[in-house]
Interface confidence: low
């Protein structure tokens, strides 16, 4: 799903307050709800009728450093006989997510949000068939 | 996929630099790659064999303010005849994502990352059959 553009007002103080320095704000360390965890069914990437593989990208100046991308294994879907059925299509499910980028010049360290497109998994769909006029 | 705990070193300056004030860092405004967009197949939530609905939560002190959650419509999957097949299961695909939380007390505004579990869509899987010994 799409993340809208960040509104100008989001980083501003209330109108009655003195203005903040342009361009940077205070980021508290630590993560709210850091301990909550995904609880998905086991091995859904191999049990799905639209199975997928994962690849991992790693960047030490990003939080999270590890970002996992899914790739659909097939163009079609796997039927009850375990064979690929190309009358159906495996399609990726994408999500826009935020990561935190660490930037440093000498001893000056700052952070900035970065938007990343993540393919989370795949689903099996009926194809859109274009009828030739 | 899981986001690991943020390492203590992530928010620190290089060792040779003077220590930073405990608890907060500089957050640059603006979003890197803000304009990149999801380009998923059209209407996959209704064309999927494991279809889903979306609900939207809204919070003006969060970026993004709008977080969209998917809910699988069925326990089973939709077969070629458009009927639910309960020999297969529709299961949610979850993703841990980060949002930015705005906190203000009077004229003091700060920000903190928050982890949110998002259900992005659903996929159709073969059920795990538990054999009774």
């Amino acid at each position: 799903r799409k993340i809208p553009k960040v509104g100008h007002t989001f980083f501003q103080k209330p109108e009655s307050c003195p203005p903040v320095p342009e361009g940077s704000m205070k980021l508290d360390t630590g993560i709210i709800n850091e301990n909550q965890r995904v609880s998905m069914s086991r091995n859904i990437e191999s049990r799905s009728t639209s199975p997928w593989n994962y690849t991992v990208t790693w960047d030490p100046n990003r939080y999270p450093s590890e970002v996992v991308q899914a790739q659909c294994k097939h163009l079609g879907c796997i039927n009850a006989q375990g064979k690929e059925d190309i009358s159906m299509n495996s399609v990726p499910i994408q999500q826009e997510t935020l990561v935190l980028r660490r930037k440093h010049q000498g001893c000056s360290v700052s952070f900035q949000l970065e938007k990343v497109l993540v393919t989370v998994g795949c689903t099996c769909v009926t194809p859109v068939v274009h009828h030739v006029q | 996929r899981k986001i690991p705990k943020v390492g203590h070193t992530f928010f620190q300056k290089p060792e040779s630099c003077p220590p930073v004030p405990e608890g907060s860092m500089k957050l640059d405004t603006g979003i890197i790659n803000e304009n990149q967009r999801v380009s998923m197949s059209r209407n996959i939530e209704s064309r999927s064999t494991s279809p889903w609905n979306y609900t939207v939560t809204w919070d003006p002190n969060r970026y993004p303010s709008e977080v969209v959650q998917a809910q699988c419509k069925h326990l089973g999957c939709i077969n070629a005849q458009g009927k639910e097949d309960i020999s297969m299961n529709s299961v949610p695909i979850q993703q841990e994502t980060l949002v930015l939380r705005r906190k203000h007390q009077g004229c003091s505004v700060s920000f903190q990352l928050e982890k949110v579990l998002v259900t992005v869509g659903c996929t159709c899987v073969t059920p795990v059959v538990h054999h009774v010994q």
Epitope: N53, C72, H74, N89, P92, H130 | M40
Partner: nanobody, 122 residues
Framework: DVQLVESGGGLVQPGGSLRLSCAAS??????MGWLRQAPGKEREFVAA????????YYADSVKGRFTISRDNSKNTLYLQMNSLRPEDTAVYYC?????????????????WGQGTLVTVSS
């Protein structure tokens, strides 16, 4: 968005071989395909490969002669064309689709390269 640049086209005699390459910048986990357009004809599907590279499809007219492959570490798609025939003469395009709706339909590919001309003639 994905940018695609094809190379490797040229003039070849019937029965000869060519290897087309397509360098992709941007996302590389899309399914990708090769399509072609002969003079005065519509674009037609040639071959497709899944994002992981596990899965390939071919038009009947090229099956057994052409091989599609990809190297995700190099962000490159390939088409090895053997036993070329005069009717293979066309501009060859590499294209990508975020989850192919329908592999055979040229209308369902969204990002296209500029094309590379393959001429098979004696």
């Amino acid at each position: 968005d994905v940018q695609l640049v094809e190379s490797g086209g040229g003039l070849v005699q019937p029965g000869g071989s060519l290897r087309l390459s397509c360098a992709a910048s941007g996302r590389t986990y899309d399914a990708m395909g090769w399509l072609r357009q002969a003079p005065g004809k519509e674009r037609e599907f040639v071959a497709a490969i899944s994002g992981s590279g596990d899965d390939t499809y071919y038009a009947d007219s090229v099956k057994g002669r052409f091989t599609i492959s990809r190297d995700n570490s190099k962000n490159t798609l390939y088409l090895q064309m053997n036993s070329l025939r005069p009717e293979d003469t066309a501009v060859y395009y590499c294209a990508t689709r975020r989850g192919l709706y329908y592999v055979w339909d040229a209308n369902d590919y969204e990002n296209w390269g500029q094309g590379t001309l393959v001429t098979v003639s004696s």
